[in-house]
Interface confidence: medium
């Protein structure tokens, strides 16, 4: 059987768990006595279409309720375990009163008020975080949602929505609470070499040192196998066997658009003629694949002072 819960002296409306998309009438019974629940609105507990309404609920209403959907060829029975709790004396909301947790991120910053669709409610919905009313402009209540601008980990906590259900000219309070957690939303992507450009030619002076930086970005978050490295004539620098040419270990950086990037620097202590004929490949790779930008060196033309 399914479970539903509510708070004493608040409205509670529940649906028959067997209803599916059925349009057939639903009858409700007290499971233990098999006594039928009436449809007259003057009763505190009554049936309305497929819904069972407690207006308001009392602790003694707790128990198992049966609903029967009568269709021409089949009767379907569902059971609902209803528990009405006393209001918690302190601000700490026990787990048994919590609806499902919402996991938010910088892209998902919306909390929906649980079960509100079952009620005849009117805006605005009031929202509380850890029992304090939310009044900062960052928090915006819209229809049944709470929107949070610029979400951070500080926004984690228990959020309670409070609204009124109107029935027969009487207003009833309803409150519902759920937790909100913030996930650092990482993403992974095929590596992008941001520098040097593709097929770049760099000017160097013979006998002088030269350094070429290679930077690549990989997305945001944890990066499995992400690396940036240099090859010379398709051989990794360590195996090339030229002590003058060294690769400086890749260092972590963050790009302007908040992506995780790595940089590796190729250093030549004294450029020789031979170095101009070599091909230098900057490789960036991660689990999605590998990209290569080839760089060539050319002699810097002396400035003509004529």
């Amino acid at each position: 059987s399914k479970s539903s819960w509510g708070l004493e002296n608040e409205a509670l409306i529940v649906r028959c768990p067997q209803r599916g998309r059925s349009t057939y009438p639903v009858e409700w019974y007290y499971s233990d006595t098999n006594e039928s629940i009436p449809t007259q609105k003057r009763n505190r507990i009554f049936v309305s279409r497929d819904r069972l309404k407690f207006l308001p609920a009392r602790v003694e209403d707790s128990g198992i309720y049966a609903c029967v959907i009568r269709s021409p060829n089949l009767n379907k029975t569902g059971y609902l375990n209803v528990t009405i709790h006393k209001k918690p004396p302190s601000c700490n909301i026990p787990d048994y009163l919590m609806y499902s947790t919402v996991r938010g991120s910088d892209k998902n910053f919306k909390i929906t008020c649980p079960t509100i669709d079952l009620y005849n409610w009117t805006a605005p919905v009031q929202w509380f975080k850890n029992c304090k009313a939310l009044q900062e402009p960052r928090f915006r209540a819209h229809r049944s949602y709470l929107f949070i601008d610029n979400v951070t980990h500080d926004d984690e906590g228990d959020y309670t929505c409070q609204f009124t259900h109107a029935e027969n000219g009487t207003n009833y309070i309803v409150t519902a609470t759920r937790s909100f957690t913030v996930e650092e939303k990482g993403f992974s992507m095929f590596p992008v070499i941001t520098n040097p450009p593709y097929n770049h030619t760099m000017e160097v002076e013979i006998g002088k040192p030269a350094s070429i930086a290679c930077s690549a970005c990989f997305g945001k978050g944890s990066h499995f196998l992400a690396d940036v490295l240099w090859q010379i004539n398709k051989t990794v620098v360590g195996n090339f066997g030229e002590a003058r040419i060294q690769e400086e270990e890749g260092r972590n950086e963050s790009s302007s658009n908040d992506m995780d990037c790595l940089t590796s620097v190729l250093r030549i202590t004294g450029v020789t003629e031979k170095d101009l004929s070599l091909e230098y490949d900057c490789l960036a790779l991660n689990l999605h694949g590998m990209i290569r930008h080839t760089i060539r060196l050319r002699r810097k033309q002396p400035i003509d002072h004529r």
Epitope: S188, F224, L225, D227, L229, K234, L285, L287, M290, R292
Partner: antibody
Framework: QVQLVQSGAEVKKPGSSVKVSCKAS????????MHWVRQAPGQGLEWMGV????????KYAQKFQGRVTITADESTSTAYMELSSLRSEDTAVYYC?????????WGQGTMVTVSS | EIVMTQSPATLSVSPGERATLSCRAS??????LAWYQQKPGQAPRLLIY???TRASGIPARFSGSGSGTEFTLTISSLQSEDFAVYYC?????????FGQGTKVEIK
Amino acid sequence: QVQLVQSGAEVKKPGSSVKVSCKASGYTFTDYYMHWVRQAPGQGLEWMGVIIPVLGAAKYAQKFQGRVTITADESTSTAYMELSSLRSEDTAVYYCAKGWGAFDIWGQGTMVTVSS
Amino acid sequence: EIVMTQSPATLSVSPGERATLSCRASQSVSSYLAWYQQKPGQAPRLLIYGASTRASGIPARFSGSGSGTEFTLTISSLQSEDFAVYYCQQYYSYPWTFGQGTKVEIK
């Protein structure tokens, strides 16, 4: 054309090791990753690990950590997968597969039977 | 790890009919999804990568769609050679994981 040719079927005793080879041809061996995937009889595909020849670095699925070693020999364009401490449930067809994330070329598979 | 779930486990289709296979990821894999075909006694063959790009030499009757957590492989008109097992695989995050497979059989 691009192809991966694997070594022949093996029958092994529980507790022993097996080393399967995968010779690549038709492409630049160091430019692509080499994955190993296994398939037990009548079962689905299970990723075991990957080697990046250009780095000489390998990464393994948690399940096989400590029991599998993947290596590559650039000079012969061959990748190897060694699985140790064999048990009967390691009986499977072992495939090497070229590619980065998606595996575009597969070896023909090597049947490894573990039986006492 | 990301769990890939395929449905249905078996699909019975008549030749010439359309087949629709589903694959769901336990969390978003963006478009880093591949589909493979495997026939008895053979190695798998890559059909689709990047969720919707056909691999080299794959007939146009195979198409892939979806992104995030829901993906579909559609075979528009089944030929006799298409009866096989189909696997989806994510390569968005380590470890790479496969679905359990959908067997497409002759009705």
